[in-house]
Interface confidence: medium
């Protein structure tokens, strides 16, 4: 279930997945929540004297058991991901941080009169992920009232340093507050020939679009269908970017589908989860567990309740079925997407709904009887 | 190209511009189309920037200033640098680029013929070097593709001009005794082509030189005929790997 408590002066030992910089424990928890494998995190609010570069370190962790040994560490804050916390799930982070310089690649600098104006500039710039504002009291006069728009490959600061009279914060695109607009177009049989930032395996262009929406540097995508001529690229979703923020003119290409990230949308922002169950499809990945259930919906529910499960395959093959139901293989991968997709008539596959804001469940707290 | 003249669109349809997109986008090297999915260039172009995803390849282009963020380009799927290439020497300066998606051939974008292994001793008389590189040693990249005709220089003679370096049989030299016409910085990886028996052949890949267009200092090129087996083997093994990694 949902574990939202934080543990002060506690550090989880082992289970390291990734380390990033975040300005506070709440943001670290958010990053853990949306990381495909992170279940636990430890954040260093204070650094030991010998390790100043570890201050603001957010250490994302995983564990087969869902827990890790706790050690006492002054200034550390630890907790759980909110992957199973329904209504508490939100990528939006509106806090601003006084006296912090969140560092990254500075790609734009302009004069603004307030922090709010700077945050708005960032929210309305396609490339901006976070910002730093120098107040009128900043020690270098030439930078006073300057708004620095920043980005990084991870979407999080490359380092964080305490600096007087600097204020930092994040873009509010994930809060659906961007005014950039939201191109919903899907281009059938067109490919974008822009710079690839990553690639994942997805069953269709809509999952590809959602993956793009939640990737820190994806602006648009091209998905190659199962009919695409190059076998190794079938069902591959190429996440793309460009300097201008817009794709180059698409190339006509049969069995390619292209479109845009929806991260600047105000109303049509998708949830970071995929409801659809794909019949005749098998998702490959690292095997977590196998149970026997009745129906693909029940398999999806089992996957959703199993916190480490990212996707599943339900098999109706005779050898995979017995009295209590058919085989439900719970799976995971490093990026949360299948490592390969194959087409099998007797299989059905889908994703965990653990990151959906409202997870429909048959376990209702109040049963309403029909009259 | 030092001492060259402007080319016209479609005159050298195999010529591509290899550009790097880091903070800004810049032309770095030339290259030659040798197949729908294959570009031949110099290995040394990738020293310092060995990351395939930052390279953009533009074909069918005459004027680099007309490239905008809407201009289509090709991305690198696979970068194959000669296994014996070491940046700390001038030898084996050859690389193959496999493109993410095959090129559509047009009158402005099509391949150049490779010589055969038997052409290692062929005497070529009508040879041209092309590129967007500097027009003088301390110059700058040119917008319009430049061309220059240039005579080949026998290796023994070339070695005499380069007492400080070793000119191997896998290199071919071209230049005028009096200097004045040569490839230069930014032309690396581009083609040295010769018309022989009525068709253009890729004889050399622009590699290095002592400055540019200096008297008694010819340009040094990778001799393509010496690498035919390597080129064919790499293209073939890439096709076989693609079959091995494809889903059942």
């Amino acid at each position: 279930g949902c574990l939202s408590q934080l543990y002060a002066n506690t550090f989880f030992r082992g289970g390291d997945l990734a380390a990033i910089y975040t300005p506070d424990a709440q943001h670290c928890q958010k990053m853990c929540t949306f990381h495909p494998r992170c279940l636990l995190f430890s954040f260093l609010a204070v650094s030991p004297t010998k390790e100043t570069d570890k201050r603001f370190g957010c250490f994302m962790k995983e564990s087969i058991t869902g827990t890790l040994p706790r050690i006492h560490r002054t200034g550390a804050i630890s907790g759980h991901s909110l992957k199973q916390c329904g209504h508490q799930l939100s990528a939006c982070h509106q806090d601003i941080y006084e006296g912090l310089d969140m560092r990254g690649s500075n790609f734009n600098i302009s004069k603004t009169d307030s922090i709010e104006e700077c945050q708005k500039l960032c929210t309305n710039n396609i490339h901006c992920q976070f910002f730093t504002y120098a107040t009128k009291a900043f020690h270098r006069p030439e930078y006073r009232k300057s708004c620095l728009l920043k980005r990084s490959s991870s979407g999080t600061p490359t380092s964080i340093k305490p600096v007087d009279n600097l204020v930092s914060g994040f873009s509010l695109k994930s809060c659906a507050l961007s005014e950039i607009g939201c191109p919903m177009d899907i281009f059938q049989h067109f490919a974008f020939a822009d710079l690839n930032v990553s690639q994942v395996v997805t069953p269709d262009a809509f999952v590809c679009r959602t993956v793009c929406t939640f990737h820190p540097n994806c602006l648009f995508f091209t998905f190659y269908t199962n009919e695409w001529e190059t076998e190794s690229q079938r069902n591959v979703c190429f996440l793309k970017t460009s300097k201008s923020g817009r794709p180059s003119p698409p190339i006509i290409q049969e069995n390619a589908v292209s479109g845009y990230s929806l991260f600047t949308c105000r109303k049509a922002r998708p949830e970071p989860c995929h409801f659809k169950i794909y019949s005749g499809v098998a998702f490959e990945g690292e095997e977590l567990n196998a149970t026997f259930v009745q129906g693909a919906d029940a398999c999806q529910e089992t996957c959703t309740k199993t916190i480490r499960c990212q996707f599943f395959t339900y098999s109706l093959l005779p050898q995979d079925c017995k009295a209590e139901g058919c085989k439900c293989s719970l799976r995971l991968s490093t990026d949360g997407s299948p490592t390969r997709i194959t087409y099998e008539a007797q299989g059905s596959s889908g994703y965990s709904l653990r990151l959906c804001k409202v997870v429909e469940s048959s376990d209702c707290t109040t049963k309403i009887n029909a009259r | 190209i030092v001492g060259g003249t402007n080319s016209s669109l479609g005159e050298w349809p195999w010529q591509v511009s290899l550009q790097v997109k880091l903070v800004s986008q810049n032309h770095m090297c030339g290259g030659s189309i040798i197949g729908r999915q294959w570009i031949l260039t110099a290995a040394h172009c990738f020293d310092g920037i060995p990351y395939p995803d930052v390279w953009r390849i533009y074909g069918g282009i005459l004027n680099l200033s007309e490239i905008t963020n809407k201009t289509p380009f090709s991305s690198i799927k696979e970068l194959i640098i000669h296994q014996k290439y070491k940046m700390s020497e001038g030898s084996y300066d050859i690389a193959l680029i496999k493109l993410q998606t095959p090129l559509n051939y047009t009158e402005f974008q099509k391949p150049i013929c490779l010589p055969s292994k038997a052409d290692t001793n062929t005497i070529y008389t009508n040879c041209w070097v092309t590129g967007w590189g500097y027009t003088k040693e301390r110059g700058e990249t040119q917008n319009i593709l430049q061309k220059a005709t240039i005579p080949l220089v026998p290796n023994e003679e070339c070695q005499k001009k380069y007492r400080d370096y070793v000119i191997t049989k896998q290199m071919i030299c071209a230049g005028y005794k009096e200097g004045g016409i040569d490839a230069c910085k930014g032309d690396s990886g581009g083609p040295l082509v010769c018309k022989h028996s009525g068709r253009w052949q890729l004889v050399g890949i622009t590699s290095w030189g002592e400055g540019c267009a200096r008297k008694e200092q010819p340009g040094v090129y990778t001799k393509v005929a010496e690498y035919i087996d390597w080129i064919l083997e790499k293209i073939q093994s890439s096709k076989e790997r693609a079959l091995e990694t494809s889903p059942a």
Partner: antibody
Framework: EVQLLESGGGLVQPGGSLRLSCAAS????????MIWVRQAPGKGLEWVSY????????TYADSVKGRFTISRDNSKNTLYLQMNSLRAEDTAVYYC???????????????????WGQGTLVTVSS | DIQMTQSPSSLSAFVGDRVTITCRAS??????LNWYHQKPGKAPKLLIY???RLQSGVPSRLSGSGFGTDFTLTISSLQPEDFGNYYC?????????FGGGTKVEIR
């Protein structure tokens, strides 16, 4: 094994001269560019001069131009630095180093220093 | 002349720490950037040439990166023998210039 051994350093008065030698072994000396680099006491490194394999081309730092001459004798596998009109600011440990070839953007240059001698101290003082 | 600015000028770190030294050129130098290590009373030793190429015999815990004006030398896990001075050097154009050096001390 590549070895470079400097000699000829010592105490000299301002305006005086010295000739440094660098004996090379363990590699084909005539195929490599050679370099002199110096380091004043407690200070950083300063490139002084450079000579091509054949000895046909030499280059100098502005601070020594016209006063120092680099030369080589490929038959003796030896590099030299003739230092004239010495000044107090020339006081330093002088290192000879071998230049490695680097090919980049159609330029083939000898410009990193892959093997160094142990150095010889030159003191210019009255 | 091209100025090479190294930072920090000195640092103190524990064995096993990750150490990063940066070098900035006053104008773009492509990848013509080399790194050297010098122990007190000894000659410098080449570590990395052409920004990212490891000289033979140099341990793989050292790595270099960068292009243009900004370069980095990283020691992934500091060892006792890594103390001393580190210098960057541009070889884009004569005069070849060195950075001011970074003194690395083991705590």
């Amino acid at each position: 094994e590549v070895q470079l051994l400097e000699s000829g350093g010592g105490l000299v008065q301002p305006g005086g001269s010295l000739r440094l030698s660098c004996a090379a072994s363990g590699f084909t000396f005539s195929a490599y560019s050679m370099i002199w680099v110096r380091q004043a006491p407690g200070k950083g490194l300063e490139w002084v001069s450079y000579i091509r394999p054949s000895g046909g081309r030499t280059t100098y730092a502005d601070s020594v131009k016209g006063r120092f001459t680099i030369s080589r004798d490929n038959s003796k596998n030896t590099l030299y630095l003739q230092m004239n009109s010495l000044r107090a600011e020339d006081t330093a440990v002088y290192y000879c180093a071998r230049g490695g070839l680097l090919l980049w953007n159609r330029e083939l240059k000898s410009n990193y220093f892959d093997y160094w001698g142990q150095g010889t101290l030159v003191t210019v003082s009255s | 002349d091209i100025q090479m600015t190294q930072s920090p000028s000195s640092l103190s770190a524990f064995v096993g720490d990750r150490v990063t030294i940066t070098c900035r050129a006053s104008q773009p130098i492509d990848n013509y950037l080399n790194w050297y290590h010098q122990k007190p009373g000894k000659a410098p030793k080449l570590l990395i040439y052409a920004a990212s190429r490891l000289q033979s015999g140099v341990p793989s815990r050292l790595s270099g990166s960068g292009f243009g004006t900004d370069f980095t030398l990283t020691i992934s896990s500091l060892q006792p023998e890594d103390f001393g001075n580190y210098y960057c050097q541009q070889s884009y154009t004569v005069p070849y210039t060195f950075g001011g050096g970074t003194k690395v001390e083991i705590r």
